[in-house]
Interface confidence: low
């Protein structure tokens, strides 16, 4: 028997369901009584789900996994993982044994989009050209860690005097805070882009300083 899985990682959004595809080519006359199917975590060998002795032995992994019982006889050994969490990320191995055995590993990449950044200024009044200001760009509840880019109104990257911190919450999702320290010109726009590298999702925020007062562009 030869096991086949997707070469590319399965990307799943947090709190959605994911299918880890695994298939084999059953010989004519194959019956489920001959099948031993085991899903396990590749690195730790922890049992995730199994089908042995002609029946589904159920989930051994926080009761969030399921097989596709009606499709097993056709060679579909895929695993459904419900309500995906950050901690589910990693490699899963599908073992199929009929008379001989084979196995293959599939990777699960978990992702969560970042929120539209909120922008804050300090100080936020009595601003004059030549003043040093601190602009903070905050985006929340994303995964994995973000890439943050700053640009001025002409689209020129701002790389100096930028400090970015990312903190994971109890669910493993990241809150991003990026601080730009800049000397004000007569006026100017400063934009922050928070990119999720897995989803290729960009979240934009900007602030425009035109002497007085400050304006925050509406959400697009």
């Amino acid at each position: 028997v030869e096991v086949q899985v997707s070469e590319d990682p399965v990307v799943a959004l947090v709190d959605t369901d994911a299918t880890l595809r695994c298939s084999f080519s059953p010989e004519p006359g194959f019956s489920l009584a001959q099948l031993n199917l085991i899903w396990q975590l590749t690195d730790t060998k922890q049992l995730v789900h199994s089908f042995t002795e002609g029946r589904d032995q159920g989930s051994a992994y926080s009761n969030r996994t399921a097989l596709f019982p009606d499709l097993l006889v056709q060679g579909n050994a895929s695993l459904r993982l419900q309500r995906v969490r950050v901690t589910d990320e990693g490699s899963y191995t599908c073992f199929v044994s009929i008379q001989d055995f084979d196995s293959a590993a599939v990777s699960l990449q978990v992702a969560a989009p970042y929120s539209k950044p909120s922008m804050t200024l300090e100080p936020n009044k009595d601003l004059r050209p030549g003043n040093m200001v601190t602009i903070t760009c905050s985006s929340y509840q994303g995964y994995p860690e973000a890439e943050v880019f700053w640009k001025d109104g002409q689209g020129v990257p701002l790389t100096g005097n930028v400090t970015t911190s990312q903190m994971a919450n109890e669910r493993g999702l990241f809150d991003v805070h990026s601080v730009l320290r800049v000397v004000l010109g007569a006026n100017g726009t400063y934009s922050c882009l928070v990119r999720n590298p897995v989803l290729q999702q960009d979240a934009h925020g900007s602030v425009t300083i035109t002497g007085q007062p400050l304006t925050f562009p509406p959400e697009a």
């Epitope: 086949q4 070469e7 001989d100 084979d102 196995s103």
Partner: antibody, heavy 116, light 111 residues
């Protein structure tokens, strides 16, 4: 009876290209991964490339990555190996083999000679 | 230099038992099943042993395979002159994302 028949080999100059074909019969071609394995004159076996049954996922040996492309046409029961930028060290008998992780049937091979 | 290491040659007289070793690492033999191939002179390779120790139909039970840790072995008992051939081990290497072969062992049947 499973049969694999390679074709497309021959003499080619360094830097040239060749396309090998492997016609399969006697099994459900679309259900199985397929592979190419080569053997230089007087040398051992060297795996070249493998492809999943549907054709979406492909693997290559480092020595051919970026130069060779494996593909398949399940409607024609045929496996292909497009070889570009050929080098003298690519000279070998090229075998088509059934499966991706265990080569249970092999063709008789086609000889590729790269020489000026 | 092959990823899997085999002795370049082995020999025995008819009726003897010979063993061919294949040594790898945790990323290949240690984590995937081993296959053995026989290549008779002037012919294409043939599947001899799969999944470490299983024989396809048509392969005599004089051929047997085993695996322990990161090494595998092919044993041929009751050696015959028609067993004179090159023998290769092979498996998938998870680190290289590639199938790897041993360098091959040339078996000579003496006398």
């Amino acid at each position: 009876e499973v049969q694999l028949l390679e074709s497309g080999g021959g003499l080619v100059q360094p830097g040239g290209s060749l396309r090998l074909s492997c016609a399969a019969s006697g099994f459900t071609f679309s259900s199985y991964g397929m592979s190419w394995v080569r053997q230089a004159p007087g040398k051992g076996l060297e795996w070249v490339s493998g492809i999943y049954s549907g054709g979406s996922s492909k693997y290559y040996a480092d020595s051919v990555k970026g130069r060779f492309t494996i593909s398949r046409d399940n409607s024609k029961n045929t496996l292909y190996l497009q070889m570009n930028s050929l080098r003298a060290e690519d000279t070998a008998v090229y075998y088509c083999a059934k499966n991706r992780l265990r080569f249970d049937y092999w063709g008789q091979g086609t000889l590729v000679t790269v020489s000026s | 230099q092959s990823v899997l290491t085999q002795p370049p040659s082995a020999s025995g007289t008819p009726g003897q038992r010979v063993t061919i070793s294949c040594t790898g690492s945790s990323s290949n033999i240690g984590s995937n099943s081993v296959t053995w191939y026989q290549q008779l002179p002037g012919t294409a390779p043939k599947l001899l042993i799969y999944s470490d120790s299983h024989r396809p139909s048509g392969v005599p039970d004089r051929f047997s395979g085993s695996k322990s840790g990161t090494s595998a072995s092919l044993a041929i008992s009751g050696l015959r002159s028609e067993d004179e051939a090159d023998y290769y081990c092979g498996t998938w290497d998870a680190s290289l994302n590639a199938y790897v072969f041993g360098g091959g062992t040339k078996l000579t049947v003496l006398g």
